[in-house]
Every structure is written in structure tokens, then in C-alpha cells.
């Protein structure tokens, strides 16, 4: 329960806080658990204790191990354990899972990525930020205090973000890097596979030869503003514009509506002066978005005009 995992890279600074808390006036003793050897407090040592903090300036792979901290007060002692692992620097860009701090989620409204563990260090702004090992450039990215702000967050902003800063100890500078994953969630709504409400799959629509007919393709795509969603008609698997029959036209623009809070689109296909050959065509209502594409097919059948003779 009072054990904490800490990790760092060789030749970087690593500062670890004792998992057991106490008042600043309480003394904290640190030991290397394997040997029970006391950690010195003199700052001239590469590894030294400073109250609740254990400092590796800089860290070495051989420093890996379990460290014991004992918080001493006049009335009690509290013991904690810091499990420290120092890794060799990776030669390639890949940041392994074991070097990752907790994943954070962001959205269009809230896109702060905090630099992990930075509050333990003596650092000065600005922080440097990298995404998937590339330095972040452009006005959308703003390094602010101990966090990164991304303006107009998009799904493409998801990835691994590394912050890099300098820890200063008695005039000496040490580099520190920390990486965490960032995922993007849409606060406004969500996106689904298209759900075609009309027409029904393999619907047969009765039409009168010589009269006009309308077919409506209607589909819903999720909640809130939808990015890249469309409904359209095809004739025998061909775009209406490419089919080359001027009597058959798609309504210009798509009508947007909201059904039970869902964002829906509809597109009307207008057939002027229905002819016999129109009954042989396959009419496909297509609904598509980033998730995918769904199609419902309609065919026309002849509706016999009502006999008005007495």
C-alpha cells in the first residue's frame, strides 16, 4: 500500500517522493533496501536524500532497486517504499509502455496535457513538448506553465506526448523527460455507423408512369455536430451526376434534422415523368461517414392508375 513505482532514464535527473507523508518538520531517513545502507544527505553525492525527496542527479541503471523511507516524528515512525527503475535511453523514437505515465483525455473544450512529476523538480519555463518524438510547432500548441494546451483539438491529436525540461540543483543543470498518451474524446457528441431510417432495405416503391416520383434517403450518424457525414443516391451503382439522365436529379444540398437528439441527413431523389425503363434501375440510398458506408436498395414498380370511369 505504501509502495510507489518510479522510473527514469539514465543520465537524466530523477526525483522520488516518499510515499508516506508527514509534516515538513518531521525527519525522513532513506535507505537502500537491499543493503540497508543509509542514503547520504550531502548534496555533493550523485544520489542523496533531501527530506521527503530522494534525488538521482543524474540517474544510472545501477540505481534501480527498492528504497525505504522512514518518516520519524516524536510519537511514531512511518515506513514507505520507492521501487525505482532506471532504463537505458532508447535509440529509436518508440517510447515503451513501461516509460509511460497515465493516459489523459482531452476534448475540444479541454485540452490540457500536464507534464508528469514536474512539481518535484526545480525548473524554469518554457517546457519543450514533443509528439511521437517530433517537436511541436504551430500556433495551435501553447506551452503554458507545467502543461501543454492544444487549440481546436482533433482526433489526429491523439498520441504520445513528451515534455522535456531542465532541473537545476545548485547551479548544475540536468535534463528530464516524461511521456504520456493523450486521447481525444468528443464532448459535444459522438459518431456512429450510419443508420438508414428510410427507405427500408429492398423496398419496392409504386410509381405511376408519366407522373413524377420522389424518393427520400434519410440516415442518422450520431449525436452533435458530425464531421464528414453524407447521404446520396446512386443509380445502378453510379453517381446521379455521372448517370446522365436529366429527368432524374438529386435535390441540391442535404437537409439536416435532429431526431431524438441524433444528427440526421436526408436527400431527395426526384424522378420527372417516370418511364418504363426507370423500373429496371436499382436505386441505392447511401449513407456514409468516417466509420463506414451503408446502403439500402429501392426498386420501382408500376402502380396502375385508378379507373375513374363510371
Amino acid at each position: 500500500k505504501f509502495s510507489k513505482q518510479s522510473w527514469g532514464l539514465e543520465n537524466e535527473a530523477l526525483i522520488v517522493r516518499c510515499p508516506r507523508q508527514g509534516k515538513p518538520s518531521y525527519t525522513v531517513d532513506w535507505y537502500y533496501s537491499q543493503t540497508n545502507k543509509s542514503i547520504p544527505t550531502q548534496e555533493r553525492n550523485r544520489v542523496f536524500a533531501s527530506g521527503q525527496l530522494l534525488k538521482f542527479l543524474p540517474a544510472a541503471v545501477a540505481d534501480s532497486g527498492i528504497y525505504t523511507c522512514i518518516v520519524r516524528s516524536p510519537t511514531f515512525n512511518r515506513t514507505g517504499y520507492a521501487n525505482v527503475t532506471i532504463y537505458k535511453k532508447q535509440s529509436d523514437c518508440n517510447v515503451p509502455d513501461y516509460l509511460m505515465y497515465s493516459t489523459v483525455s482531452g476534448s475540444e473544450k479541454n485540452s490540457k496535457i500536464y507534464c508528469p512529476t514536474i512539481d518535484l523538480y526545480n525548473w524554469t519555463a518554457p517546457l519543450e513538448w514533443f509528439k511521437n518524438c517530433q517537436a511541436l510547432q504551430g500556433s495551435r500548441y501553447r506551452a503554458h506553465k507545467s502543461f501543454l494546451v492544444i487549440d481546436n483539438v482533433m482526433t489526429e491529436d491523439a498520441g504520445d506526448y513528451t515534455c522535456k525540461f531542465i532541473h537545476n540543483e545548485n547551479g548544475a543543470n540536468y535534463s528530464v523527460t516524461a511521456t504520456r498518451s493523450f486521447t481525444v474524446k468528443d464532448e459535444q457528441g459522438f459518431s456512429l455507423f450510419p443508420v438508414i431510417g428510410a427507405p427500408a432495405q429492398n423496398e419496392i416503391k409504386e410509381v405511376e408512369i408519366g407522373k413524377n416520383a420522389n424518393l427520400t434517403c434519410s440516415a442518422c450518424f450520431g449525436k452533435g455536430t458530425q464531421f464528414l457525414a453524407a447521404v446520396l443516391w446512386q443509380l445502378n451503382g453510379t453517381k446521379i451526376t455521372d448517370f446522365g439522365e436529366p429527368r432524374i436529379q438529386q435535390e441540391e444540398g442535404q437537409n439536416q434534422s435532429f431526431s431524438n437528439g441524433l444528427a440526421c441527413l436526408d436527400m431527395v431523389l426526384r424522378i420527372a415523368d417516370v418511364k418504363e425503363e426507370d423500373l429496371l434501375l436499382q436505386y441505392d440510398c447511401l449513407a456514409l461517414n468516417l466509420h463506414g458506408l451503408r446502403r439500402h436498395t429501392v426498386r420501382l414498380s408500376r402502380k396502375n392508375p385508378i379507373d375513374h370511369h363510371s
Epitope: L192, F193, Q234, L288, G292, L293, R294, R295, H296
Partner: antibody, heavy 120, light 107 residues
Framework: QVQLVQSGAEVKKPGSSVKVSCKAS????????MHWVRQAPGQGLEWMGG????????NYAQKFQGRVTITADESTSTAYMELSSLRSEDTAVYYC?????????????WGQGTMVTVSS | DIQMTQSPSSLSASVGDRVTITCRAS??????LNWYQQKPGKAPKLLIY???SLQSGVPSRFSGSGSGTDFTLTISSLQPEDFATYYC?????????FGGGTKVEIK
């Protein structure tokens, strides 16, 4: 007949990128979604993402977001999948698969697969 | 993400046997479930789509059933060419996810 023909096997170094192609024939390329699915040796199937050529915009599984790029060239009826920052765990057979006509989330036609080996 | 769990992971059967493979989704996926067959060194092949519809060209001994979270693939009379690995796949939402597979071996 309808078929998807993929590019040949690749051997890559960790940290590098690979681009696999998938040439479609026998159907109207723009009318169908194209998916990419991978299968590590002795393992199951894993969806990476896909693209609707008439949109030209891809959808990726979160796991691959930022590392994978799927594109489509209508003029040659070819889809491409590029995976960057390769690691040994990316060693797998990579398949392109056509989405179904009525529902693009079914994989009705598959390419023969491209073996990508990542090794130092 | 929707998790798909297949059982059993492998089974041994004889030619002529009736074989049943089950697939469970971590949440309701209506009838958005597909089944695939894969033979060693080959690409998967679509057998059943929308839980129960037989893909064109697939023998009628294959059938699918179920909706919501529980689905079944049945081979009514196992043939020599049916020894393969079978995967279920949900097509309800992205990321599209597969079950771990069921290997059907000769007893």
C-alpha cells in the same frame, strides 16, 4: 472477377516505415470501403482502419492513430497502408479487405496478404 | 471498444459431426455480427453476415444465429474442407473487433 492484389513481402528495421499497396480490380473501386487488417504470427485478426475512396478520408483504430496512414488512389484503383515507427511487435501479415456493398463493416473480399517482418 | 469472446478456443471433431461455436459481445450489438473461416497461410473468407445471412457461394451446412450479445455458428455436418480457424467480428461500431478464433481440428 473481383480481386485485391497486394504488394510483396517486406523486411524492415525498427523505427522505419513500410507502405503496402492493394490493387483492386473487377469492381467500381470508389463504391466500396477498403479496410486494413493485420495478423501477427499465430495470432488473431486486428482491424487497423479503413477508407472510403469517394471521401478520401480514413478512420483508424485508436491503437494505430498517429502511426498509420491509409490512402486511396482512384485513378489506379489502389489503396495504400503506411505504418511508421515500426517495432518488432508489428511483424505480421497485413491484409486489405473490401467492405461489403450494403454494409462496409463486413469484409467480403480479401487480398492475399503481405508479410512484414520487423527485425534489427 | 467492444470485446468479442469466442468459445471454445479449439475443438476436435470428426467428418459428419455437428459443430457449434459461440461468440459473446461485451455489449449489445443487435445483429451486427459476421463469421469468417481461415485456413493456414490463406486470407479469411466471409461465411455469415448480419448474424444469420449466408454469404453467396457458402455451403448451406453453415448457419448463424443470435442477436444482442450471444451468437452461434453451426456447421450441420462437418466436411474435410471445414477444418480451419473460425472468427467472429462485430460490425456495430468502430474499432471493428474480432473474437480470438476457434480452431476446428480433426479428431
Amino acid at each position: 472477377q473481383v480481386q485485391l492484389v497486394q504488394s510483396g513481402a517486406e523486411v524492415k528495421k525498427p523505427g522505419s516505415s513500410v507502405k503496402v499497396s492493394c490493387k483492386a480490380s473487377g469492381y467500381t473501386f470508389t463504391n466500396y470501403y477498403m479496410h486494413w487488417v493485420r495478423q501477427a504470427p499465430g495470432q488473431g485478426l486486428e482491424w487497423m482502419g479503413g477508407i472510403i475512396p469517394i471521401f478520401g478520408t480514413a478512420n483508424y483504430a485508436q491503437k494505430f492513430q498517429g502511426r498509420v496512414t491509409i490512402t486511396a488512389d482512384e485513378s489506379t484503383s489502389t489503396a495504400y497502408m503506411e505504418l511508421s515507427s515500426l517495432r518488432s511487435e508489428d511483424t505480421a501479415v497485413y491484409y486489405c479487405a473490401r467492405g461489403g456493398y450494403y454494409d462496409s463493416s463486413q469484409f467480403d473480399i480479401w487480398g492475399q496478404g503481405t508479410m512484414v517482418t520487423v527485425s534489427s | 471498444d467492444i470485446q468479442m469472446t469466442q468459445s471454445p478456443s479449439s475443438l476436435s471433431a470428426s467428418v459428419g459431426d455437428r459443430v457449434t461455436i459461440t461468440c459473446r459481445a461485451s455489449q449489445s450489438i443487435s445483429s451486427y455480427l459476421n463469421w469468417y473461416q481461415q485456413k493456414p497461410g490463406k486470407a479469411p473468407k466471409l461465411l455469415i453476415y448480419a448474424a444469420s445471412s449466408l454469404q453467396s457461394g457458402v455451403p448451406s451446412r453453415f448457419s448463424g444465429s443470435g442477436s444482442g450479445t450471444d451468437f452461434t455458428l453451426t456447421i450441420s455436418s462437418l466436411q474435410p474442407e471445414d477444418f480451419a480457424t473460425y472468427y467472429c467480428q462485430q460490425s456495430y461500431s468502430t474499432p471493428l473487433t474480432f473474437g480470438g478464433g476457434t480452431k476446428v481440428e480433426i479428431k
